[in-house]
Interface confidence: medium
């Protein structure tokens, strides 16, 4: 799998989309997991509703939400109030039994918060950044990881 990069702004919301073949993955629940190390396990963050027919319902774990359009074949993950520690490698998964197929490998990059540079004369409400429903705070800049690019930031 190629890795797709999604960039989001710190303090705002990031939407990650994972397209898949809706027929091939019919009846399967989906999950979002975080890769622990380059060869480590993928730790489950959140999964879709236990009843596959209700996969369209948004489920939350902390600040991460998941929803699945099973007909259209798009899994959507929302990372609310994105923070620097959210940066890293993730996977969208399709579950069957105890197995999991990787739908997409995702590298989340967190950009600096431009709000930090707003001056006092601006009218800014904290809740505007927290509200993932507001279209103007949704950012999803994605690109494919180039061959040879390292999906993990160097450890300090």
């Amino acid at each position: 799998h190629n890795t797709t990069v999604f960039q989001g702004v710190a303090g705002q919301s990031l939407q990650v989309s994972c397209p898949y073949d809706s027929m091939k993955h019919w009846g399967r629940r989906k999950a979002w997991c975080r890769q622990l190390g380059e060869k480590g396990p993928c730790q489950r963050v959140v999964s879709t509703h236990n009843l596959w027919l209700l996969s369209f319902l948004r489920r939350w774990n902390g600040s991460t939400a998941i929803t699945d359009d099973t007909l259209g074949g798009t899994l959507t993950i929302t990372l609310r109030n994105l923070q620097p520690h959210d940066a890293g490698l993730y996977q969208c998964q399709s579950l069957h039994g105890s197995e999991a197929d990787t739908l997409r490998k995702v590298l989340v990059e967190v950009l600096a918060d431009p709000l930090d540079h707003r001056d006092a004369g601006d009218l800014w409400f904290p809740g505007e950044s927290e509200s993932f429903e507001d279209a103007h705070v949704e950012h999803s800049i994605s690109r494919s990881l180039l061959e040879g690019e390292i999906p993990f930031p160097p450890t300090s």
């Epitope: 710190a10 600040s63 109030n81 923070q83 004369g121 601006d122 800014w124 904290p126 809740g127």
Partner: antibody
Amino acid sequence: EVQLLESGGGLVQPGGSLRLSCAASGFTFSTHAMTWVRQAPGKGLEWVSAISANAGKTYYADSVKGRFTISRDNSKNTLYLQMNSLRAEDTAVYYCASLRGGYEVGPTFDSWGQGTLVTVSS
Amino acid sequence: DIVMTQSPDSLAVSLGERATINCKSSQSVLYSSNNKNYLAWYQQKPGQPPKLLIYWASTRESGVPDRFSGSGSGTDFTLTISSLQAEDVAVYYCQQHYIWPITFGGGTKVEIK
């Protein structure tokens, strides 16, 4: 010393219009967001409208949306509130206030004028 | 809209005694990016405009006496006057400055017993 002086209040009939002004001095008006807050006689505070320093952003309470317009003239250090289609329930003392804003603080009203009374009655 | 509910509506306290005012918001006003609560308190004396006392739930505005203190987080907040003075007779309002529309509590009238 920060001074905010409201004017333009008075008695107006329902359906009528008024334009309130707020003359600011003692601070750099052009770098401060501003707001209008009202208080009906014997009642609590109700936020009405706010405008960013460069007038690029405006907000209105649902109760006045479509009837009131906030504006400012930074060259005259003056804030305005154009009030149209006035109703009896708009009767109140109208205060103008400077907003301490920006990323960290969020809008708090740090300096207030003395207010101007608007009475809507036939 | 965030609804701010204050209690009690009025409060009579002896001079030098503690006065406590509560404010509850219908949703959290805690901004998780900086862990600050966007809740302010104002004092309005008879015939005067309101005056900012506290913002971020617990940060006193400069010049405000230290007998005024704010506490709380999320949805439940308290303004405390540790030792009531005659000049503290006023109506006190909480206000959320977390998201528009800005909303105020209904006010609490503090009197001397």
